[in-house]
């Protein structure tokens, strides 16, 4: 199993902990919002399947100037085996559908919760 570093603690983090922390962060950024998440920015919808973490990062990395999701972007990079830069897209994107970041986060959060309950931590 691959262990992920760079989250809440120094050194390796078990995948289950990393996934739980990502879920907690997504919940956190949706709570007690005073303004629309990322000012209502739109991102490409993705297929929530294998390779989802990289696809999610590829979509969210194109949102600039949104401090609320910076930690999420960093955490997703820990799940993605390759470096992702703005403007980079994989075949996992549903390139005909753009949704608000707020909706993207709901979709991602639900999928991650299901993975966590099913014990799929990688």
């Amino acid at each position: 199993l691959t262990c992920l570093g760079g989250f809440a603690s120094p050194g390796p983090v078990p995948p289950s902990t990393a996934l739980r922390e990502l879920i907690e962060e997504l919940v956190n950024i949706t709570q007690n919002q005073k303004a629309p998440l990322c000012n209502g920015s739109m991102v490409w919808s993705i297929n929530l399947t294998a390779g989802m973490y990289c696809a999610a990062l590829e979509s969210l990395i194109n949102v600039s100037g949104c401090s609320a999701i910076e930690k999420t972007q960093r955490m997703l990079s820990g799940f993605c085996p390759h470096k992702v830069s703005a403007g980079q897209f994989s075949s996992l994107h549903v390139r005909d559908t753009k949704i608000e970041v707020a909706q993207f986060v709901k979709d991602l959060l639900l999928h991650l919760k299901k993975l966590f309950r099913e014990g799929q931590f990688n």
């Epitope: 997504l26 949706t30 709570q31 919002q33 608000e100 707020a102 909706q103 959060l109 639900l110 309950r117």
Partner: antibody, heavy 118, light 109 residues
Framework: QVQLQESGPGLVKPSETLSLTCSVS????????WSWIRQPAGKGLEWIGR???????NYNSSLKSRVTMSIDTSKNQLSLKLSFMTAADTAVYYC????????????WGQGTLVTVSS | SYVLTQPPSVSVAPGQTARITCGGN??????VHWYQQKPGQAPVLVVY???DRPSGIPERFSGSNSGNTATLTISRVEAGDEADYYC????????????FGGGTKLTVV
């Protein structure tokens, strides 16, 4: 504590347009999705549509041609217009807030009864 | 269009466990939310995202979701649990929309 209050006419004539307002207090209207949901007497819940502060909407396909939703962030209000009303549109109309983290509804108004009759 | 099917009624004795089902094509891939509605009142969210509980909702309320069926389970049923219960999902397709089940009347006998 977030509170939602629907207001509008209790009686609408057939073929007329229903106009309802939902006033939100205790929280910002800007950061959530908001929906209108209706319930005919003794029947189940029917989703009418949703709106975000950007003005982007999703409507129930069966009502799409008759529905218009809008949002006024300065007044913390949202509105629903439903045209060409018939007796089948008689129902309690609710506004509800979509949770920030899921597609569930965590806050509801108390509902307002709208009757369509001549 | 996506359809959610609930039994019209479920009866249970006080202290027993009530199970209310919500059927839908591959519903296990969706997030299911459950509401309790008492006469003359607005619905109240009791379970969201299959099995999460909002604050203030007793632990007696729980949910599960897999395959083509989601289930709301109410353990140690009390007289005050008598109400209509609705399941709800968000259908993410080219035409995003919300769907409610037809509702189940829970009677505590």
């Amino acid at each position: 504590q977030v509170q939602l209050q629907e207001s509008g006419p209790g009686l609408v004539k057939p073929s007329e347009t229903l106009s309802l307002t939902c006033s939100v207090s205790g929280g910002s209207i800007s950061s959530y999705y908001w929906s209108w949901i209706r319930q005919p007497a003794g029947k189940g819940l029917e989703w009418i549509g949703r709106i975000y502060m950007t003005g982007r909407t999703n409507y129930n396909s069966s009502l799409k041609s008759r529905v218009t939703m809008s949002i006024d962030t300065s007044k913390n209000q949202l509105s629903l217009k439903l045209s060409f009303m018939t007796a089948a549109d008689t129902a309690v109309y609710y506004c509800a807030r979509e949770s920030g983290s899921s597609y569930s509804y965590d806050y509801w108004g108390q509902g307002t009864l709208v009757t369509v009759s001549s | 269009s996506y359809v959610l099917t609930q039994p019209p009624s479920v009866s249970v004795a006080p202290g027993q466990t009530a199970r209310i089902t919500c059927g839908g094509n591959n519903i296990g891939s969706k997030g299911v939310h459950w509401y309790q509605q008492k006469p003359g009142q607005a619905p109240v969210l009791v379970v969201y995202d299959d099995s999460d509980r909002p604050s203030g909702i007793p632990e007696r309320f729980s949910g599960s979701n897999s395959g083509n069926t989601a289930t709301l389970t109410i353990s140690r049923v009390e007289a005050g649990d008598e109400a209509d219960y609705y399941c709800q999902v968000w259908v993410s397709s080219s035409d995003h929309h919300v769907v409610f089940g037809g509702g189940t009347k829970l009677t505590v006998v």
